[in-house]
Each structure stands twice: as C-alpha cells, then as structure tokens.
Amino acid sequence: KAMHVAQPAVVLASSRGIASFVCEYASPGKATEVRVTVLRQADSQVTEVCAATYMMGNELTFLDDSICTGTSSGNQVNLTIQGLRAMDTGLYICKVELMYPPPYYLGIGNGTQIYVIDPEPCPDSD
C-alpha cells in the first residue's frame, strides 16, 4: 500500500529561469486533502523549496511569496518553479502527503534534476 510518486528524471530550465515538471502519484486511498512539497537535495542536505495543501478538485495554491506555482488534475500536479539561476541547478524532489482522511500516506519521488544556465549578457552595441 505504499504510495508511488513519479516525476521526470531531467528538466532544463528556460532562459528566463523557469522550470516546469509533472508530479504524478498513485493514491492508495481516497484522499480529500493533499499536501505537495518540493524539496531540493544538494549533497546530503534537503531543504524545502515550496509547499501547498489543496483539497481534491480545488486548485493548488502556494503562498504569495513562493517561487512555485502549480495546477492539479486528479492525481497529477503540474509544478512550475521560477526565478532559478545557475547556482540553483540540482535535484528537486516531489513529496506528496495524503493528509485526510486517515490513513496518512507519504510518497517521495526519485527527484528531477533541473539544469539552469544563466543567459549570456547581451554585448554592448556601439
């Protein structure tokens, strides 16, 4: 009854520092409240990038100051992370928790390696 979470292995951020990927979970139960968290793993350190709790059938809402946005459809969440720079290149893990009703389930994806390349500055034109 473990919950499986799938996400793409690799994503390349756009030149504007935006990366999008789909996080899909196989729900073992009929959850009405789901929490989705994006974690970044660098070396052995794990940090939270953003998190949102949503009711099934409703929209996914991150905090106003979050660098993440997203939409949900059934057991699929479309995540977008913005404001990324080359130093943010790393492994981004999708974590899904079925919060309500009981029982609680935890699902952790294998991670999406996001590559971010800072755009070259435009040359001065004489």
Epitope: A2, K95, P103
Partner: antibody, heavy 118, light 108 residues
Framework: QVQLVESGGGVVQPGRSLRLSCAAS????????MHWVRQAPGKGLEWVAV????????YYADSVKGRFTISRDISKNTLYLQMNSLRAEDTAMYYC???????????WGQGTMVTVSS | EIVLTQSPGTLSLSPGERATLSCRAS???????LAWYQQKPGQAPRLLIY???SRATGIPDRFSGSGSGTDFTLTISRLEPEDFAVYYC?????????FGQGTKVEIK
Amino acid sequence: QVQLVESGGGVVQPGRSLRLSCAASGFTFSSYGMHWVRQAPGKGLEWVAVIWYDGSNRYYADSVKGRFTISRDISKNTLYLQMNSLRAEDTAMYYCARGDLLGAFDIWGQGTMVTVSS
Amino acid sequence: EIVLTQSPGTLSLSPGERATLSCRASQSVSSSYLAWYQQKPGQAPRLLIYGASSRATGIPDRFSGSGSGTDFTLTISRLEPEDFAVYYCQQYGSSPWTFGQGTKVEIK
C-alpha cells in the same frame, strides 16, 4: 543548534491528567510534522501521536485515541501532549521527535518520564 | 497496520566483528520509508539510516542499510565499543507509524 526539550512528566494517579511540553529551537517549527513517541520501562518504542505543519491534521495511536490530544503553539515553538484518563499502561518515557523533510524522525528530545500509579 | 519483526532479539558479538540485523515487514514497505535507530541505555533514540540505505548526518560509514519489499537489513561492518546498543527499525510511509521490537547488540 537544533534541539527539542521535553518537560511536564511526573507521578500521577490513574484517571488523572498531565500535560507534556516540548520546546523546539534551531529550526523552522512550522515546516515539520512533530511526533510523540513513548517507551515503557524495559520495552520498545511506541508511536503515540503526530501533528502536522499548521496543526490542522493530527493522528493518534489507537491506544491513546480519545484520551490524548496533541497540539502546537507556533508562536512559542512548543509542542504539547495533553493526557487525560491516564492508565497504568501509559507509564513510560515520552519523547518528542521531529519528522524530517523526508519523513524519518531525525531529532529527538531527551524524554520526560510519566508514571501512573496509585 | 504494518507490523515490523526484528531478528534476532539479541546478538552477542565481540568488538571488530560484523553485525547483521534483520527487519521483516508484514506487508511491502517502499525502501524510501524505512529507517533504523540506535538507542543506548538512558538515552533517546538516534537516527542512523533513512530511506533504507541513506546514512543520517554524522553516522560513520561502518553502518549500512539495505533491502526492499518486506526484508531489510542493518549491517555494522566492524563493531566498535560504542556500537553496543539496541537497534530499532521503523516504517514511516503510512499511519500508524510503527517500530520493530528491537535487537540488542551486546558484548560477547
């Protein structure tokens, strides 16, 4: 540094109540699920209760459901366990533990002993 | 509820020897949600391994975890004097969170 410190344990008579506290420091308290785990003398570990993030969701072991209430005060960075209708079998060392971002219990307090005896 | 059964109950070994501890689950547990803890007398448990095989911060590399499905193993490659303690496995993939009954590693 990251730390959890429990308090509030003691000797109490069966049927009475007790409130345990767990003061957290060194991390963003509201980003983590917080658990209570107990250990009867000479026995193994038993999970008791968890409270999530903003406190909206809580889960309990069947053995304490309806008698214990877990809560948290984010402004005080403190976790609580209100224990009512205590029984002799609730005698144990009570630990608070942080559920890390990947789910394991990575930080534990030193424990507070609760003895239920007449 | 997922029941975890640890074996053996007690392991009597000498420093320098290899310790192999087993944890068997009553139903399949994803390796992402299996942890091992060490507990010494009078102390709180300490996280050793999470995700079945990842060492927690500061844990020496003589500790390793492996396994999948229903069978998991904690191995201590060469026992140091400070490793004699009780070890617990735990699953945290679904509620209720459950622990094994523990394996005591004692000095022979």
